[in-house]
Interface confidence: medium
């Protein structure tokens, strides 16, 4: 039996920050679980981890240096990513593992979310169009 995961197909990070919600076909209340967010088609980079147990005190960390946080809903985990770089535009996959109570459960691979990080480009002011041609 596998948990199904729903994610937005695409998100745009305009201010180098984005909230990605992972929705599960499973209620995480009073469960010991490990929710994680992975970057790349091969999910090679573990961006952020949210670990929860019955006390409902979440442990959140990124061993890959991302600025991330997480919030828990009954059937969802929302990852908050900040200080993203343009070159971190990629596809991101939600993963969930339920360790307790038995049986161990994990998810079918989701379709992922493309996070498009928009850089902050300085635009020339229309008040100063530059030198005009004679």
């Amino acid at each position: 039996n596998k948990i199904l995961v729903k994610q937005s197909p695409m998100l745009v990070a305009y201010d180098n920050a984005v909230n990605l919600s992972c929705k599960y076909s499973y209620n995480l209340f009073s469960r010991e679980f490990r929710a994680s967010l992975h970057k790349g088609l091969d999910s090679a980079v573990e961006v952020c981890v949210v670990y929860g147990n019955y006390s409902q005190q979440l442990q959140v960390y990124s061993k890959t240096g991302f600025n991330c946080d997480g919030k828990l809903g009954n059937e969802s985990v929302t990852f908050y990513l900040q200080n993203l770089y343009v070159n971190q535009t990629d596809i991101y996959f939600c993963k969930i593992e339920v360790m307790y109570p038995p049986p161990y459960l994990d998810n079918e691979k989701s379709n992922g979310t493309i996070i498009h990080v928009k850089g902050k480009h300085l635009c020339p002011s229309p008040l100063f169009p530059g030198p005009s041609k004679p």
Epitope: L58, Q59, Y61, S62, C68, K71, N83
Partner: nanobody
Framework: EVQLLESGGGLVQPGGSLRLSCAAS????????MIWVRQAPGKGLEWVST????????YYADSVKGRFTISRDNSKNTLYLQMNSLRAEDTAVYYC????????????????WGQGTLVTVSS
């Protein structure tokens, strides 16, 4: 090398306030939940409070709820603990730690601890 340096402790009268600071270096501070724990004289370690990496979530032990406030400034790599309405039973050495280090403190992560700062509440 990971370094955590606590400061701000001291002697305070019951009902008084203190603000503890913890300056972190040697790891990616904004990437980890951080905690305060304390050790009263002759007692074991007691968890006090946790804050998530970007400060979205905070947690407190029942014994300090409503009196202590945890916060962090990721731009300064610094963790804080504002302690109000202090009681004699708050007397302890206060330590900050990266949360995974605390949960795995029987392992090699034990180095992720500071020297602590002593808080004495007495009249």
């Amino acid at each position: 090398e990971v370094q955590l340096l606590e400061s701000g402790g001291g002697l305070v009268q019951p009902g008084g306030s203190l603000r503890l600071s913890c300056a972190a270096s040697g790891f990616t501070f904004p990437a980890y939940s951080m905690i305060w724990v304390r050790q009263a004289p002759g007692k074991g370690l007691e968890w006090v409070s946790t804050i998530s990496p970007l400060g979205y979530s905070t947690y407190y032990a029942d014994s300090v709820k409503g009196r202590f406030t945890i916060s962090r400034d990721n731009s300064k790599n610094t963790l804080y603990l504002q302690m109000n309405s202090l009681r004699a039973e708050d007397t302890a050495v206060y330590y900050c730690a990266e949360q995974t280090a605390y949960l795995n403190r029987a392992t090699e992560h034990f180095d992720y601890w500071g020297q602590g700062t002593l808080v004495t509440v007495s009249s």
